[in-house]
Interface confidence: low
């Protein structure tokens, strides 16, 4: 008799794929544009990335460091009007993209939370949550919560408002902290909070250290849902050399939790390559004309247009991973088991019941390595087969779909492999 199927877990929409942050509308759209009406024209692009949610803004009125001139209920006219926002929500809904609004109050100022007027600001946030929930947003983000006194209790209250409106609404908190204990204390009192932090940003470039960070985090957070990113707002290129971008994309999309990216991560957007551009929000490179300041500074392979036409590009990899992440049960909500694969490597299995299973092997090092996969580390429910099919490699040159012998697996420098194999009773 066939074994009973495992009951599917309740899945919220943010469990089903990546979130995409657009913190700076002007930089994202470029060409002196940068409003809500223009963003609506980019929703098809977001659809092509298969992202599930757009984390937008902040876009509210905020006069630098002035509480009285900060209105969380009003959109800064430079970004658009309430009707433009409404229109964006409508179009996004039609494309199945959820909209999360960043309500970090003093986003133009020194202290995001006006340190001297915490209660006034907290009340403003409460009112804003209720107002924007009524307007149809799918969730909220607040950043820099390490600057918010009594953050845990405020977050719990805001979470109650958000969840009280609908279980389908999401609250994201962001912190610059990379300290696990600090992160855990924020999570403790907030069951469903999604927290973005700098926890992974100092993972360096060793597989062992990354493995240790990931497993520590997952063990410490138990079976609560988490998110994966390298910071609360910044680009991957702020932390990673170009040769590790593909590896991290593969990892972020295949760890258990919600991957969170910033605009430009999908093309390896790098402020350092664009003289005069701010590190935190460089102009998005749609095509070679997106950065006219220095003619010739932008080549086609740095842009969305150029990478869209190249099946071997970072953007093409992002799209493929995003697609897999959103449709494979084992990647959507499967169990996670990390195991030893040799020095410099990080490897893990994702599996769910009798569905197709996935093996991820990541070589963080700058030399080619043979993987010594230690299957003995794995529980019986997650045993390794002798061979697995190559779904994709982060490096060109491998024949996709071909079976690879796991005992004789060799990885190129900075290569990541995503392999699939069937459930065997």
């Amino acid at each position: 008799r066939a074994p009973r199927c495992r009951e599917l877990p309740a899945q919220k929409w943010w469990h089903t794929g990546a979130l995409y942050r657009i913190g700076d509308l002007q930089a994202f759209q470029g060409h002196g544009a940068g409003n809500l009406a223009g963003l609506k024209g980019r929703l098809d692009y977001l659809s092509s990335l298969k992202v599930k949610g757009l984390v937008l803004g902040p876009i509210h009125k905020n006069q630098k460091d002035d509480v009285a001139q900060t209105d969380l209920l009003q959109i800064d006219p430079n970004f658009g009007s309430k009707e433009d926002f409404d229109s964006l929500l409508q179009s996004a809904k039609k494309k199945s993209i959820r909209v999360i609004l960043d309500l970090t109050p003093n986003y133009r100022g020194e202290n995001s939370w006006f340190s001297t007027q915490v209660d006034t600001v907290a009340t403003k946030v409460k009112d804003a949550l209720e107002f924007w929930l009524q307007a149809g947003v799918d969730g909220f983000q607040v950043r820099d919560i390490e600057n918010l006194k009594d953050a845990s209790s405020f977050l719990a209250e805001w979470q109650n408002i958000t969840k009280g409106f609908s279980e389908d609404r999401l609250l994201i908190a962001g912190t610059n902290s990379s300290d696990l204990q600090q992160i855990l204390s924020l999570l403790e009192s907030n069951k469903d909070l999604l927290l973005t932090s700098s926890y992974l940003s100092d993972s360096g470039s060793t597989g062992e250290h990354t493995k240790s960070l990931v497993t520590q985090y997952l063990n410490a957070t138990g079976n609560r849902w988490c998110s994966w990113s390298l910071s609360q707002a910044r680009l991957l290129t702020s932390f990673l050399p170009a040769q590790l971008l593909r590896l991290y994309q593969l990892m972020l999309f295949t760890l258990p939790g919600t991957p969170v990216f910033s605009y430009g991560d999908e093309i390896g957007l790098d402020a350092a390559a664009l003289p005069g551009q701010p590190m935190e929000a460089p102009v998005m490179l749609w095509d070679e004309s997106s950065f006219p300041d220095i003619p010739g500074a932008v080549s086609a392979n740095m842009t969305v247009k150029g990478q869209s036409e190249d099946p071997g590009s970072l953007l093409s990899l992002f799209r493929r991973l995003s697609d897999q992440r959103s449709k494979e049960r084992s990647l959507l909500h499967g169990d996670f088991h990390a195991f030893s694969a040799g020095p410099g490597l990080f490897s893990y299995i994702r599996h769910w019941d009798q569905n197709e299973r996935f093996l991820v092997v990541l070589n963080f090092g700058d030399v080619g390595l043979s993987a010594g996969l230690q299957a003995s580390d794995l529980p019986a429910s997650a045993s390794l087969p002798a061979k697995a099919d190559l779904l994709l490699s982060t490096q060109p040159g491998r024949e996709e779909g071909s079976p690879l012998e796991l005992e004789r697996l060799k990885l190129e420098p900075h290569e990541g492999l995503l392999l699939r194999f069937p459930y065997a009773a």
């Epitope: 006219p77 309430k82 009707e83 229109s87 409508q90 307007a135």
Partner: antibody, heavy 120, light 106 residues
Framework: EVQLVESGGGVVRPGGSLRLSCAAS????????MTWVRQAPGKGLEWVST????????GYADSVKGRFTISRDNAKNSLYLQMNSLRAEDTALYYC?????????????WGQGTLVTVSS | EIVLTQSPATLSLSPGERATLSCRAS??????LAWYQQKPGQAPRLLIY???NRATGIPARFSGSGSGTDFTLTISSLEPEDFAVYYC????????FGQGTKVEIK
Amino acid sequence: EVQLVESGGGVVRPGGSLRLSCAASGFTFDDYGMTWVRQAPGKGLEWVSTISWNGGGTGYADSVKGRFTISRDNAKNSLYLQMNSLRAEDTALYYCAGYCIITGCYADYWGQGTLVTVSS
Amino acid sequence: EIVLTQSPATLSLSPGERATLSCRASQSVSSYLAWYQQKPGQAPRLLIYDASNRATGIPARFSGSGSGTDFTLTISSLEPEDFAVYYCQQRSNWWTFGQGTKVEIK
């Protein structure tokens, strides 16, 4: 042909209630935000209330907040304004207007109005 | 609440003359400003949206300009049918209308 037809106006005593309706045809109603605008006899235009395409977002002028409620039924292509605790200063011709949020334009479809008179 | 102040209250001109109507906002509305024309017994008619864009079917003699807090509606050469009341309207934060400018025959 686009049409917005208001109804439900009439004479009512101060403190009384009325419910205005606006029937829409000739355009895709649920692509449009809808608004009530009023005009007291011999006076200018005054915005009253707006509702978003899906009914999720609503806004009210300070003068009617807490007394008037805007709603819509997309299945019936209809917009409503429930007016309670009416005052003499609410006497006006009430227009319903549709603004096309798909292109981010202004209220470009207007009805001919329904007259509300609040008098003892 | 954003207050819109129109000037002048009344403008007396002859057909063929140029009309310049002004609208000032109490705070910046970016370019989220419209102009409407209203004739007695009729509903308002949209002329200009987003400060300078002519609505469908509006003659080229009507033009709008401005951004932030100061806006202008210009009718380059008045036709007999242009004598009416003109309202500006913002949609930066919900809606508000100006009090109107009446353009009458001199």
